[in-house]
């Protein structure tokens, strides 16, 4: 009896695992084995596919074959007993295009009101994703074990911290990877659960803010208790994206080590241009808090968002205000790469009633002023980008007297 060729061959590629599945064409024939050949683009000859020769089941693994994952490949299969079936050719495919991203590896770390999620690619040193390792982003679904109400978090990297959780509560989550550059969405990891710890005696510092004063950064935070010492650490933000590396070398800011106030001042030259994460921890000498929420700190925006410098030209019924770039040390203007909006506040020197003007232009007219009256003006800059949403501090107030009447020209 002639053997029929196997049918419905499926190629499943997950990360670096290459699996073939097929249907027996004739279930009634026993002791049949199956063998595959492969052919690379531009080749005429067929080569035996190692790992997929004389297979008795309907599944085989050819992961050991070192293929160029960006090169098209063709497969063929036949059944064998005493004689052989004709070859059945599988549609050619490019492994990279066909590949799915496997479930990532997940390790969880619990605090009292936070969970740190450490995510690594499921296949270490993957050949399939060798050129894309740094492009992985992850998304997760998290829920309280008791309620099951799911929250989705998109676009996270290999380390992600979720805050504002409840102590002594079990949370469960699953994570999947994505390669947005290749339009690939991976499969979810198994569900991982972890219980947050009992509430810590000392809460972490809150409401961390960075501002610029003179040539210094001023870091401020809030804390519940008095008589504490604090330390501040920084990390390059891009290190959170490093796949598989979960050693985060947080660095101390020397001027912010063991400070006894809820602020610290350090020179701008501590940081080179870049984006950093900052965190603060409190200690009472015996106990330490967990670290605060990490804030993102962009030196370009911070340095650039110094209060604006302005000149006033006084008329009888108005001021003309000319806004210039803020000055650094050495009186050099700061280069502004971001579109700004200016908030100008003015008031009569003898009154507390403030008026406000918001203006995109750098020359602004303040109208409806009284002649021979002293008015004071202060200004600050805001970024127009919603995502950055930064504001400078107000400039020092400048006070000027309007001219006598009829000097509008």
């Amino acid at each position: 009896k002639n053997l029929k060729s196997p049918q419905k061959v499926e190629v499943d590629i997950i990360d670096d695992n290459f699996i073939l599945r097929w249907n027996r064409s004739d279930e009634s024939v026993g002791n049949v084995t199956f063998s595959f050949d492969y052919q690379k683009t531009g080749m005429d000859n067929w080569i035996k596919l190692s790992g997929c020769q004389n297979i008795t089941s309907t599944k085989c693994n050819f992961s050991s074959l070192k293929l160029n994952v960006y090169e098209e490949i063709k497969l063929r299969i036949r059944a064998e007993k005493e004689n052989t079936s004709s070859w059945y050719e599988v549609d050619s495919f490019t492994p990279f295009r066909k590949a799915q991203i496997g479930p990532p590896e997940v390790h969880l770390e619990a605090e009292d009101k936070a969970i740190v999620i450490h995510i690594s690619p499921g296949t270490k040193d993957s050949v399939m994703w060798a050129l894309d390792g740094l492009s992985f982003t992850y998304s997760l679904v998290i829920w309280k074990n008791s309620s099951g109400v799911e929250e989705r978090i998109e676009n996270i990297y290999s380390r992600h911290k979720i805050y504002k959780l409840s102590p002594e509560t079990t949370y469960c989550l699953k994570v999947k990877a994505a390669l947005l550059t290749s339009w690939k969405i991976g499969v979810y990891s198994p569900v991982h659960c972890i219980k947050t710890t009992v509430e810590n005696e000392l809460p972490p510092p809150e409401n961390i803010e960075v501002s610029v004063q003179n040539q210094n950064y001023v870091l401020k935070w809030d804390y519940t208790y008095a008589n504490m010492t604090f330390q501040v650490q920084w990390l390059h933000a891009f290190l959170k994206r490093n796949p598989g590396n979960h050693l985060y070398k947080w660095k101390q800011i020397p001027d912010c080590e063991n400070v006894k106030t809820t602020q610290c001042v350090f020179p701008q030259n501590v940081f080179q241009k870049g984006i950093y994460l900052l965190r603060v921890q409190a200690s009472d000498g015996n106990n330490t808090s967990f670290w605060s929420e990490e804030i993102k700190f962009d030196t370009e925006i911070q340095a650039f968002l110094l209060p604006p410098v302005f000149n006033i030209r006084s008329l009888s019924d108005s001021f003309h205000i000319y806004i210039g770039a803020p000055k650094q040390s050495g009186n050099t203007p700061v280069i502004q790469d971001y579109p700004l909006i200016y908030e100008i506040i003015f008031w009569e020197n003898t009154s507390n009633a403030e008026r406000k003007i918001i203006e995109k232009k750098t020359d602004v007219t303040v109208p409806n002023l009284k002649p021979l009256t002293v008015y004071c003006v202060k200004a600050r800059a805001h970024t127009m980008d919603e995502k950055l949403n930064k504001s400078s501090v107000f400039s020092d107030a400048v006070c000027e007297k309007t001219k006598p009447g009829n000097t509008s020209k």
């Epitope: 969880l108 770390e109 605090e111 009292d112 450490h118 710890t197 590396n245 050693l247 330490t288």
Partner: antibody, heavy 118, light 107 residues
């Protein structure tokens, strides 16, 4: 294969100094921390301090600040522990360890025995 | 500094038994605890990180658990090669501290 190879045993006189080395293979030390741990005979493990070979930053337990100096040379993939003003209290085995993911010490050297005796 | 207390200096067990080594932190360290095994005359070997995750190559009879201040290393189906001293360590604070160790004796 990750390994930490430590220098050989030392017999030194009280008041002298000693320099111990620890060479990493199978990994780049600048991507990790290198820690040093002291263990006296029949006693527990005591952390001395660590170095970040990438920039030379060090952290020490206060009691070892005047005793130990930890350095690293990335070109030879080697970390060092210098112990000064040695006394009999410094007689111990000293381990170098790799500070890996999640700050745990995932690999340990074979240990260097230091004996302080006149 | 955070003190890690291993109250039992010695524990006696038999091959095939289940034994639990405990460790208590002087303050909440989350789940940032590691466990090490040191056999006589050898250097320590890492077993567990983040309180409950096994390093690759560590037999699955070793299980870590706990969070906050109380941590446990459980060895189920104890083997003769598990005769060793076990140390816990907190990695939550950059000043790392070890427990004093628990010696496991096989009857």
């Amino acid at each position: 294969d990750v390994q930490l190879q430590q220098s050989g045993a030392e017999l030194v006189k009280p008041g002298a100094s000693v320099n111990l080395s620890c060479t990493g293979s199978g990994f780049n030390i600048k991507d990790y921390y290198i820690h040093w741990v002291k263990q006296r005979t029949e006693q527990g493990l005591e952390w001395i301090g660590r170095v970040d070979p990438e920039d030379g930053e060090t952290k020490y337990v206060p009691k070892f600040l005047d005793k130990a100096t930890i350095t690293a040379d990335t070109s030879s993939n080697t970390a060092y522990l210098q112990l000064s003003s040695l006394t009999s209290e410094d007689t111990a085995v000293y381990y170098c360890t790799r500070g890996g993911n999640y700050y745990a010490m995932d690999y340990w050297g074979q240990g260097t025995s230091v004996t302080v005796s006149s | 500094d955070i003190v890690m207390t291993q109250s039992q200096k010695f524990m006696s067990t038999s091959v095939g038994d289940r034994v639990s080594v405990t460790c208590k932190a002087s303050q909440n360290v989350g789940t940032n605890v590691a466990w090490y095994q040191q056999k006589s005359g050898q250097s320590p070997k890492a077993l567990i990180f983040l309180a409950s995750y096994r390093y690759s190559g560590v037999p699955d009879r070793f299980t870590g658990s706990g969070s906050g201040t109380d941590f446990t290393l459980t060895i189920s189906n104890v083997q003769s090669e598990d005769l060793a001293e076990y140390f816990c360590q907190q990695c939550n604070n950059y000043r790392l501290t070890f427990g004093s160790g628990t010696k496991l004796e096989i009857k």
